[in-house]
């Protein structure tokens, strides 16, 4: 019998100040190309190594963002994604939706050698 | 392995126009980005125009805006750059590059290290 994957959706607001390179992540997405499924929303696919975010490890590769300085990122072309982050000033808030994976195995089951069976 | 040759440039006098052009091959076209870059004597490289298959949109730095337009061409592999109203200041070895990174969209600023092919530069000199 194999464990159910559940999933603890949690959202953050992350406030980034923008480096000497930018922000430092990509992101895929939007209403012309959906990343997910039934879903046009904007998401992490890429963090860069020393880049503004890496920098402050809150931001993760598959979060979902949800707004960038109070601007809804809901059916948004890709590109005007793209350019809102690129416009998005000095000091960039984002709000972000991170989804951790819960890994949940069947009930009554123990791993072999567990002493507290 | 992805080639980049520039040509188009020249000794122009303040005013005039000049067309780049950059020829890709070896590899496919449909990259995510092309883009334009320039280095003047004793300065760094500088962005100057990019060009996005993503809607195909374009970008431009504040320097260019209004005088430069890129374009590109599918069918012959080849990016181009129309700079009209030349200055002095616009002479520079100028650049072509190509982005290949799948991973989604940079949200950053086109910046040369985002770039994985470079052609060998055309020198513009504006008298």
């Known amino acids: 019998m194999n464990g159910r994957v559940d999933y603890l959706v949690t959202e953050e607001e992350i406030n980034l100040t923008r480096g000497p390179s930018g922000l430092g992540f990509n992101i895929v997405g939007g209403t012309d190309q959906q990343y997910v499924s039934n879903d046009s929303g904007i998401y992490v696919s890429r963090i860069k190594e020393n880049g503004a975010a890496a920098l402050d490890g809150r931001l993760q590769e598959g979060d979902k963002i949800l707004s960038v300085n109070g601007q809804d990122l809901k059916n948004l072309l890709h590109q005007d994604a793209v350019d809102l982050f690129r416009n998005a000033g000095y000091a960039v808030s984002l709000r972000v939706q991170h989804r951790l994976q819960v890994q949940n195995g069947p009930i009554g089951h123990r791993g072999e050698g567990d002493p507290s069976g | 392995h992805v080639q980049l040759v520039e040509s188009g440039g020249g000794l122009v006098q303040a005013g005039a126009s000049l067309r780049l052009s950059c020829a890709a091959s070896?590899?496919?076209?449909?990259?995510?980005?092309m883009a334009w870059f320039r280095q003047a004597p004793g300065k760094e490289r500088e962005f100057v125009a990019e060009?996005?298959?993503?809607?195909?949109?374009?970008w431009y730095s504040d320097s260019v805006k209004g005088r430069f337009t890129i374009s590109r061409d599918n069918a012959k592999n080849t990016v181009y750059l129309q700079m009209n109203n030349l200055k002095p200041e616009d002479t520079a070895v100028y650049y072509c590059?190509?982005?290949?990174?799948?991973?989604?969209?940079?949200?950053?600023?086109?910046?040369?290290?985002?770039?994985?092919?470079w052609g060998q530069g055309t020198q513009v000199t504006v008298s």
């Open positions: 590059a190509d982005y290949r990174d799948y991973s989604g969209s940079t949200v950053d600023p086109p910046n040369q290290s985002e770039y994985d092919y």
């Open positions: 060009d996005s298959w993503s809607n195909h949109r374009v």
């Open positions: 070896g590899g496919t076209f449909s990259s995510y980005a």
